[in-house]
């Protein structure tokens, strides 16, 4: 539970828990006027903000999941995790400080996000009060993928998941019993959160690779949308 959050999450408006940093979903204009002293966002800052926006959405979804079941404290996670093939960062991916490799890492981040898409699709019917949040997380992730793909030099190395395999996985996940579906939801959210946090650290390390200013309009408060890609 956020310690300083007042009011419920509603619609797509993910409150970023910071008066200076109210964010809006991709493609929507902020109702706030951009602070005059702010510089235009660089590409790097936009990606950073987009990931943090998605992470806030995940936090909201985790809040609902943990409130309605005891999955967040469950010790049976490993049992269920064996049936899921959720993307995870490893040393060989070049995203850690030791053995850091920009290209390898960027490929891993994009590939991982593409692999998470089927799981984000699964989440779409799993929430009652946070249905819009689940949609916002899914759509924002799609935009993030597109943006990162524009930055990747080695697009050939990015493997796109097979749609048929994804469709069959989705059917399998939806056919699980209630307990397993709750556990799957919890594990997807937890794993996606961890993957994004690792990505955030790695992308900050890249610095020069993604630091070209892309916004001449000075729209500090606007998140990445398709028109920016």
């Amino acid at each position: 539970d956020y310690k300083d959050h007042d009011g419920d999450y509603k619609d797509h408006d993910i409150d970023y828990k910071d008066d200076d940093d109210k964010l809006v979903p991709p493609g929507e204009d902020s109702k706030d006027v951009a602070a005059p002293h702010r510089q235009p966002l660089t590409s790097s800052e936009r990606i950073d903000k987009q990931i943090r926006y998605i992470l806030d959405g995940i936090s909201a979804l985790r809040k609902e999941t943990c409130n309605k079941s005891n999955m967040c404290e469950s010790s049976k996670e490993a049992l269920a995790e064996n049936n899921l093939n959720l993307p995870k960062m490893a040393e060989k991916d070049g995203c850690f400080q030791s053995g850091f490799n920009e290209e390898t890492c960027l490929v891993k981040i994009i590939t991982g996000l593409l692999e998470f898409e089927v799981y984000l699709e699964y989440l779409q019917n799993r929430f009652e009060s946070s249905e819009e949040q689940a949609r916002a997380v899914q759509m924002s992730t799609k935009v993030l993928i597109q943006f990162l793909q524009k930055k990747a030099k080695n697009l050939d190395a990015i493997t796109t998941p097979d749609p048929t395999t994804n469709a069959s996985l989705l059917t399998k996940l939806q056919a699980q019993n209630q307990w397993l579906q709750d556990m799957t939801t919890h594990l997807i959210l937890r794993s996606f959160k961890e993957f994004l946090q690792s990505s955030l650290r790695a992308l900050r390390q890249m610095g020069d690779l993604i630091s070209v200013p892309v916004d001449s309009r000075g729209s500090e408060q606007k998140l990445i949308s398709e028109e920016d890609l």
């Epitope: 910071d18 008066d19 200076d20 943090r52 490893a90 937890r190 794993s191 900050r204």
Partner: antibody
Framework: QSVEESGGRLVTPGTPLTLTCTVS????????MTWVRQAPGKGLEWIGT??????DTWYASWVKGRFTISKTSTTVDLKITSPTTEDTATYFC?????????????????WGPGTLVTVSS | YDMTQTPASVEVAVGGTVTIKCQAS??????LSWYQQKPGQRPKLLLY???TLASGVSSRFSGSGYGTEFTLTISGVQCEDAATYYC????????????FGGGTKVVVV
Amino acid sequence: QSVEESGGRLVTPGTPLTLTCTVSGFSLSSYAMTWVRQAPGKGLEWIGTSYVYSGDTWYASWVKGRFTISKTSTTVDLKITSPTTEDTATYFCARVGDYDDYGAHDVFDSWGPGTLVTVSS
Amino acid sequence: YDMTQTPASVEVAVGGTVTIKCQASESISSWLSWYQQKPGQRPKLLLYRASTLASGVSSRFSGSGYGTEFTLTISGVQCEDAATYYCQQGYTGGNVDNAFGGGTKVVVV
């Protein structure tokens, strides 16, 4: 929840030393942990942070192999690979608060009392 | 990302107000925390996200700032506020020399 460091002692330069951080009231499988040091009469200096599920560790740019952080299910260790007199300090271990509480940055919300390392010949 | 804190030391009378500044070498959005450390003790979290009070911390402490410029203000200073205060940027990743500022010693007279 509590955090406690141990292993600090007087060592001669070049003798490797491992400090151990033990926690209670929360699980190391759920929280990232960080090491910070403070030389006598000086300020706080961040050494590095070990993250949870991916197991990646990020160090300050000055570390350059002088320290290694490793994590087990019950402890977080800091190895001073080849101590010099400049490494004389109190070493603190601290918990990194969860994203759901603090947002997208590292907040050190629970600290140990520190353990003193003296490097002298 | 490096943090510069000013002043290094400040004297303040009981009931007075003290302001401590912290500057980041690059924008860190709102990702800044403040800590209080009394002699011989461990640091204690005061504020995070630049302006949010940590649990159990007196409302005499307040923080503000965004990007590269941040401020910690202690209003109605009490004797127990005598301590050294540190800012810390929480942007892991990238090239971090020291996440902490150099510290500001507050002497209450």
